[in-house]
């Protein structure tokens, strides 16, 4: 049943006597695995026997091993990967015919036929050309040979007129179940000179022997190939001479259809033959002549013939590479004066005066300067005479404003807060100055062009610069305004000790200021409105808590005085002046409450208290208040307290508490 089998192979395999064949083959069977494979040569089906008969080239065994048999026939497939590829090496003419692949599975049988065509001699390859070859259009030439075999090496070689072609060919080999072939592809740009030439594709064996070949004649379509001849030979003529030009068509495929003549690229009217005659030439007939001949491929133009009609220089004109030109740029002047032959000598004029040493068509100034501005004209000379000097061309040289300076219009000195007027001046400019710029930029008033008014000038307006601007800005050297102002940034700074101030320390305070103009200053120190000193430093040899407070310093110069922010001087000291106070008095009746309070003066405040009795025994109380409740007669005695902060300790003097009996106690007794 054919629907159960799917076998792929090229169908027909071509070879020649002594070569080999390689038959790529794959199969699929829907029902079970392939059990038996037999390769027949020209199999015939015997109806009576219900089986195929013929020469058996190969037969598989149960275990898939190859039997001894035809050595030149090799079955290269296997059952595992469904491959049925085979080869015959060498192959002979009488191998031509059908190869029958008999395939048997558990339930199905199939006979697949492959045609084998073995010729006596190597058959030629086939050259395939594109339908149209046109000059300079790259095409691919293909040489196809319906043969490929792993055991037999071949080569395809290209020749043009019997000479190997230099272009690199690409050879493709196919040994697939779809097709078996060897193909050589050659990229080729045909030239008109290739027209009618023979291209050969040769089939070579491994030793380079030519086995067969195919030849084609190239039909390269091309535009006409032209040459032009002039009579008389000389193309330099005088006005009134006659000239004949002949257009020769050396090759054309297909034949040419039209002819025309061009002068300086423009077609000449009613000139459509291969010969052009110019009678009594005039100056205007000088130019480049060529003929144009067309065929179906397209038009072709001959080389140009430069016909020169000689005449003396005409009135000159000067062409300037740039005007206006920027100062410092390169400027080229060109003297244009039609003449034939070309002028050999030029004379240049600047504002009517001859420029010495300049005798060429082009006059170059590498770096143009303001004084180069003006009118430039020239005269040209050739063997036929000197031309007329034209009217000249104007050169404008532009440059930034020159010698820009700035002037302070104010009487000096300038004080902070004054109104200052500045003017910006320059010596020359091209184009004219159209605006001014100022540095630094500020919300300043410009009452007139080039004048700047700074209202309420700041202390730090040190330097101002102006620029006069046309297309460019030229800056003046900055002018220092020298603004006078009272001292700034006044502050009190502790210079010693570096850490916190403890009672008894040596202390120095510095009166700092960031700037002052003028520089000469005086200092004043005050505390709570009282003047302390007139130096930049305020020194305490041994600071006491009484020195703590709010300090300010003043710095003054001839313009004014400036005070610092108040600076608080804090002195740290151990608890002092401790005393024990009793809110209820120092005589208390038993049974009542006795409250003792430890009073102290300390910075920072006391964080820990201790209480002691008359025997210096520590009492189990640690607060500022010692409460005895109910108080007993035995509590009578002297008490003292001790206070501690992070600077140190202090203790109070003794204070006596007297506890007397209550009337009840006295009554009981």
């Amino acid at each position: 049943d054919s629907s159960k089998w799917n076998i792929e192979h090229p169908g027909t395999i071509y070879a020649w006597e002594g070569a080999c064949v390689w038959v790529p083959c794959t199969y699929r069977v829907l029902d079970g695995a392939l059990e038996t494979f037999i390769l027949f040569h020209n199999p015939e089906y015997n109806q009576n026997m219900s089986k195929f008969e013929g020469t058996r080239l190969y037969e598989s065994t149960k275990d898939g091993k190859l039997p001894s048999g035809q050595k030149r026939v090799q079955f290269l497939g296997n059952k595992i990967n469904n491959n049925c590829t085979l080869s015959i090496h060498p192959v002979h003419v009488n191998d031509s015919g059908q190869l029958g692949l008999r395939m048997v599975s558990k339930t199905e049988k199939w006979m697949e036929r492959i045609h084998l065509n073995v010729s006596e001699r190597p058959f030629p390859p086939r050259i395939q050309l594109p339908p149209k070859l046109q000059e300079s259009q790259e095409v691919t030439l293909t040489c196809l040979l319906n043969f490929s075999c792993y055991g037999y090496q071949i080569q395809l070689q290209w020749l043009l007129e019997g000479v190997p072609m230099r272009q690199a060919a690409v050879t493709l080999t196919s040994l697939s179940t779809k097709s078996v072939f060897t193909r050589s592809e050659l990229k080729f740009s045909p030239q008109w000179s290739h027209h009618g030439k023979i291209v050969t594709c040769e089939l070579h064996d491994v030793d380079g022997k030519v086995l067969s070949e195919d030849m084609v004649q190239l039909n390269v379509k091309h535009t006409p190939k032209l040459t032009i001849e002039v009579t008389p030979n000389e193309t330099t003529v005088r006005k009134g001479d006659s000239v004949t030009m002949t257009c020769k068509v050396n090759s054309s495929n297909p034949e040419y259809t039209t002819v025309s003549w061009l002068k300086d690229g423009i077609p000449l009217k009613e000139q459509n033959t291969l010969m052009l005659t110019l009678h009594k030439v005039t100056k205007s007939q000088s130019g480049r002549y060529c003929c144009r001949v067309s065929n179906d491929v397209g038009p072709a133009t001959s080389e140009k013939v430069f016909l020169q009609v000689q005449y003396a220089p005409e009135s000159s004109r000067v062409q300037i590479s740039q005007s206006p030109a920027v100062e410092g740029s390169e400027v080229n002047f060109l003297c244009i004066s039609p003449a034939n032959p070309l002028p050999t000598n030029y004379t240049w004029y600047h504002n009517g005066k001859e420029v010495q040493g300049r005798t060429e068509k082009q006059f170059q100034i590498q770096k143009i300067l303001p004084w180069h501005a003006g009118t430039y004209s020239c005269e040209a000379e050739n063997i036929l005479g000197i031309g007329e000097r034209g009217p000249g061309t104007e050169l404008d040289v532009q440059y930034p404003p020159k010698k820009v300076t700035m002037v302070i219009e104010n009487p000096t000195p300038i004080r902070e807060g004054d109104t200052v007027t500045l003017s910006c001046n320059y010596s020359s400019s091209n184009p004219i100055v159209n605006h001014y710029e100022w540095r630094p930029r500020g919300a300043w008033e410009e009452p007139s062009l080039g004048v700047l008014k700074i209202q309420n000038i700041g202390w730090n307006n040190t330097a101002v610069a102006c620029a006069a601007c046309n297309n460019w800005c030229s800056w003046a050297s900055p002018v220092t305004l020298n603004v006078l102002y009272a001292p700034r940034g006044v502050r009190v700074r502790k210079i010693k000790p570096l850490s916190e101030i403890h009672s008894g320390n040596s202390v120095s305070l510095q009166c700092d200021f960031s700037s002052s103009h003028p520089k000469e200053v005086q200092f004043f120190w005050e505390k709570n409105g009282s003047l302390l000193g007139k130096e930049s430093q305020l020194n305490f040899d041994s600071i006491s808590p009484e020195d703590a407070g709010s300090y300010s310093c003043w710095v003054n110069n001839s313009i004014g005085q400036t005070a610092s922010k108040a600076w608080t001087l804090e002195v740290l000291y151990a608890p002092r002046r401790l005393r024990v106070s009793m809110s209820q008095g120092n005589q208390v009746m038993e049974g009542k409450t006795a409250t003792l309070i430890c009073e102290s003066d300390a910075n920072p405040p006391v964080y820990s208290y201790a209480w002691f009795d008359w025997n210096n025994q520590s009492l189990p109380y640690s607060g500022r208040m010692l409460r005895l409740e109910p108080v007993k007669v035995q509590h009578s005695g002297a008490y003292w307290c001790q206070g501690t902060n992070r600077v140190g300790k202090g203790h109070s003097p003794l204070i006596t508490l007297t506890v007397y009996y209550s009337p009840q106690t006295i009554g009981r007794r």
């Epitope: 100062e327 410092g328 420029v355 010495q356 040493g357 300049r358 005798t359 060429e360 170059q364 100034i365 590498q366 770096k367 300067l369 303001p370 180069h372 440059y399 020159k402 010698k403």
Partner: antibody, heavy 123, light 106 residues
Framework: QVTLKESGPGILQSSQTLSLTCSFS??????????VSWIRQPSGKGLEWLAH???????RYNPSLKSRLTISKDTSRNQVFLKITSVDTADTATYYC???????????????WGQGTTLTVSS | DIQMTQSPASLSASVGETVTITCRAS??????LAWYQQKQGKSPQLLVH???TLADGVPSRFSGSGSGTQYSLKINSLQPEDFGSYYC????????FGGGTKLEIK
């Protein structure tokens, strides 16, 4: 009165960078067309032009030394500078700065020269 | 680029003689040529600019001439102070200075 004066280190080691200063007076390098060149002369040899700077800060260099040279100016301080990188014993020479005055057309020449500063490069 | 070729490289002459030093440019330099004199241990000094204009203070025995590509410096009646090296220079050529001519006392 136009004067130019060169100053430099006198002695350098190979591979160091040479810094030269030309201080001038009597003219301004902001004047149109004005320029200053550096020229050197190895002992007993000819003049070798190195670099030129114009009033407009355009700079020209000797092509064979261009990669090693940097010319600059400070117009306000009337100074021109030349830096030569990676010096070698072949750079041992007297170094001159010279003024090129504004030309009529394009004919730059040197009308005033400094006295020269000597450089010795030791390996 | 224009090249400057100065000749001769050296020259011996006596006081009172006339000598000529030439400078050839590989292209037209339009008269923009200068000549310098350098004495031993001194800076070069400008003698001539624009091919033929004598610099201020230069004695009239010195003269420059030429055009296009050929230029020369002529010293009439050589004086003892004229001995030294002479250089031609065209700013736009590379290099701008000629190789120099050493003028020595014979």
């Amino acid at each position: 009165q136009v004067t130019l004066k060169e100053s430099g280190p006198g002695i350098l080691q190979s591979s160091q960078t040479l810094s030269l200063t030309c201080s001038f007076s009597g003219f301004s390098l902001s004047t149109s067309g004005m320029g200053v060149s550096w020229i050197r002369q190895p002992s007993g040899k000819g003049l070798e032009w190195l670099a030129h700077i114009y009033w407009d800060d355009d700079k020209r260099y000797n092509p064979s030394l261009k990669s090693r040279l940097t010319i600059s100016k400070d117009t306000s301080r009337n100074q021109v500078f030349l830096k030569i990188t990676s010096v070698d014993t072949a750079d041992t020479a007297t170094y001159y700065c010279a003024r090129a005055p504004p030309p009529n057309w394009d004919e730059y020449y040197f009308d005033y020269w400094g006295q020269g500063t000597t450089l010795t490069v030791s390996s | 680029d224009i090249q400057m070729t100065q000749s001769p490289a050296s020259l011996s002459a006596s006081v009172g003689e006339t000598v000529t030093i030439t400078c050839r440019a590989s292209g037209n330099i339009h008269n923009s040529l200068a000549w310098y004199q350098q004495k031993q241990g001194k800076s070069p000094q400008l003698l001539v600019h624009n091919a033929k204009t004598l610099a201020d203070g230069v004695p009239s025995r010195f003269s420059g001439s030429g055009s296009g590509t050929q230029y020369s410096l002529k010293i009439n009646s050589l004086q003892p102070e004229d001995f030294g090296s002479y250089y031609c220079q065209h700013f736009w050529s590379t290099p701008p200075f000629g190789g120099g001519t050493k003028l020595e006392i014979k």
